[in-house]
Amino acid sequence: LTCLGGFASPGPVPPSTALRELIEELVNITQNQKAPLCNGSMVWSINLTAGMYCAALESLINVSGCSAIEKTQRMLSGFCPHKVSAGQFSSLHVRDTKIEVAQFVKDLLLHLKKLFREGQFN
């Protein structure tokens, strides 16, 4: 995370800033949601543990054409140190559970807020 470059940032962004920016974007999504988010698309649930950012990206990257989560996908892509493609799955997914993108975003947001409060930026 220490080398994560933001939209307008000329250089590296501190992990706390990056995490806060992601939280703010997820809050924005949940607050501005009118119609079903991403037309009610379903994604694999993930274990909110180590490797969470890559797992979250691996799940959300399978949602296409959803402008509401494009910035989140970009952020998670910056958080994840390896290349992630659609259809790619890691052991971090709960493969028998699919949830709506809206629920996925809420779950992720709650967990990230907890990490931020505890100072776990990495």
């Epitope: 994560l4 470059g5 939209f7 991403c38 037309n39 949602v63 959803c66 970009r74």
Partner: antibody
């Protein structure tokens, strides 16, 4: 199999309006975005605008006032409308699908030729 | 809008040699550590075809002689070694911001 096919009027009079339809198959318009791109004879590509799967529409700044993009997902069709046509709007008009993130255009139609002339 | 300037406008390369095409953006196309620059190939009478996405990732089915590099404002498409079927016009395209743009194109001729 993913396919996109444009259909247009061919010839339009200056000052008139243009309507082009992009009919797709092999994927759903509710979860894929469609771009409109044009290419004047012997020239380069120009992005006109796009409609996202969730309905958001983005336009090229220079053409925003003359363009309208819409879709009928149930009929797998996307529509481009352009008003106040000029001779320099003569071009081949393409529709192209965005792939998954990072949303590059991975499938294109063959294009439809539009001539603006009296 | 971000303006993309390609150079050269045209080039002629001998069969088996290296072709290098440059694309310069009027402002950075980097976002959260990724470069939102893509490359397309267009042969005469055909629609464009995606070659490279995110500056350096080869699209599925594209030969390994194509490669991309660069970040922020300066990007390069390299074809090495050039084959006869690579005669085409090549375009860069950015989607770092909502209003997407293409470069002016570079026409590659094979000698």
């Amino acid at each position: 199999e993913v396919q996109l096919k444009e259909s247009g009027p061919g010839l339009v009079a200056p000052g008139g309006s243009l309507s082009i339809t992009c009919t797709v198959s092999g994927f759903s318009l509710t979860d894929s975005s469609i771009n409109w791109v044009r290419q004047p004879p012997g020239k380069g590509l120009e992005w006109l605008g796009m409609i996202w799967g969730d309905g958001r529409i983005d336009y090229a700044d220079a053409l925003k006032s003359r363009l309208s993009i819409s879709k009928d997902s149930s009929k797998s069709q996307v529509f481009l409308e352009m008003t106040s046509l000029r001779t320099d709007d003569t071009a081949t008009y393409y529709c192209a699908r965005d792939g998954y993130f990072p949303y590059a255009m991975d499938f294109w139609g063959q294009g439809t030729s539009v001539t603006v002339s009296s | 809008d971000i303006v993309l300037t390609q150079s050269p406008a045209s080039l002629a390369v001998s069969l088996g040699q290296r072709a290098t095409i440059s694309c310069r953006a009027s402002e950075s196309v980097d976002s959260y550590g990724q470069s939102y620059m893509h490359w397309y190939q267009q042969k005469a009478g055909q629609p464009p075809k995606l070659l490279i996405y995110l500056a350096s990732n080869l699209e599925s089915g594209v030969p390994a002689r194509f490669s991309g590099s660069g970040s922020r404002t300066d990007f390069t498409l390299t074809i090495d070694p050039v084959q006869a079927e690579d005669a085409a016009t090549y375009y860069c395209q950015q989607n770092a911001e909502d209003s997407r743009t293409f470069g002016g194109g570079t026409k590659l001729e094979i000698k």
